[in-house]
């Protein structure tokens, strides 16, 4: 393990998973590293092996229990350490006292479906996955629609500042193929970030009726 510029970032999915990424410039690909979790008020310790995801980046998931079980609370602290093997010993490369509900990243929304589609509008719904009941309604969403001839990066973001698991897209073009994505973020947590984007939902608006104004 070379002393390059390193970064250790972890997020809690609010239920039973802590996902971590460790990056280090100049580190050898075959360096053996792991994340060790030591909670302050739980009986368990957990370790996961960091596996390469790119040239200088490794990731692993600390799976704390069944996907929908509430394994940590707002008062928990979990000390997370990156340990890398150097010869016969393990060296601490990074350490943080991790507060799960200050470092949230939820799972991507799932079960996207078209509820109703017309020539100029489309109503879409979705569900959140493995989200803690602690949030109650304190969630927000961002959505984006991919129009023909554009990229996802160009798509304007629609913000839903409340727990609203549906959207009505307006001013669409008739008989046109679109794609739609949504992501979610709890309002809680200094280091909380957006979930990954959902899988895109493809839909097509209805064609305009012949001989009528559109």
């Amino acid at each position: 393990a070379v002393n390059g510029t390193s970064q250790f970032t972890c997020f809690y999915n609010s239920r039973a998973n802590i996902s971590c990424v460790w990056s280090q410039d100049g580190a050898l690909q075959d360096t053996s590293c792991q994340v060790h979790a030591w909670p302050d008020r739980r009986r368990w310790n957990q370790t996961c092996e960091l596996l390469p995801v790119s040239q200088a980046s490794w990731a692993c998931n600390l799976i704390l229990g069944a996907p929908d079980s509430q394994k940590l609370t707002t008062v928990d602290i979990v000390t997370l350490r990156v340990l890398c093997r150097e010869g016969v010993r393990w060296r601490v490369m990074a350490i943080q006292d991790f507060k799960p509900f200050e470092n949230l990243r939820l799972m991507a929304p799932i079960s996207l479906q078209v509820v109703h589609v017309e020539t100029h509008r489309c109503n879409i719904s979705w569900e959140i996955s493995q989200a803690s009941h602690y949030f109650e309604r304190h969630l927000e969403f961002e959505a984006r629609t991919l129009s023909p001839g554009h990229t996802w990066e160009e798509a304007p973001l629609l913000t839903l500042k409340q727990k609203q698991e549906w959207i009505c897209l307006e001013t669409l073009t008739p008989d046109t193929q679109y794609e739609f994505q949504v992501r979610v973020k709890p309002l809680q947590g200094e280091f909380t970030t957006w979930s990954p984007w959902s899988q895109p939902l493809a839909f097509r608006t209805k064609p305009a009726a012949l001989g009528k104004d559109t």
Epitope: T79, I95, Q96, D97, F191
Partner: nanobody, 126 residues
Framework: QVQLVESGGGLVQPGGSLRLSCAAS????????MSWVRQAPGKGLEWVSS????????YYAESVKGRFTISRDNDKNTLYLQMNSLKPEDTAVYYC???????????????????RGQGTRVTVSS
Amino acid sequence: QVQLVESGGGLVQPGGSLRLSCAASGFTFSNYAMSWVRQAPGKGLEWVSSITGAGRGTYYAESVKGRFTISRDNDKNTLYLQMNSLKPEDTAVYYCAKYDSSTFYPPTPARGIADRGQGTRVTVSS
């Protein structure tokens, strides 16, 4: 904005003790790793000790290990450095420092220091 105010420095004889304090404000203190660094007369900044956000991990420079103890009181937003068995070579201005995240990197202990206070002077002399 981040404010770090050190106190507790002074003149002490070799073998004596001092306790430095650092009052922090302007950020969620318990969410950040903290450290003490020092600057001896005519020298550069030297890392002394670091502590994780909840105080569960502490690290020390070899030159102070066994003599200095870092601690924190998150209810009081205060960082401490207990200095025992002081030596003339400990003479320096001591700065309280905040890291840019909750993470501390032991192999590169000065990395990520984002803010520091005005410092408190410690003189060890007979």
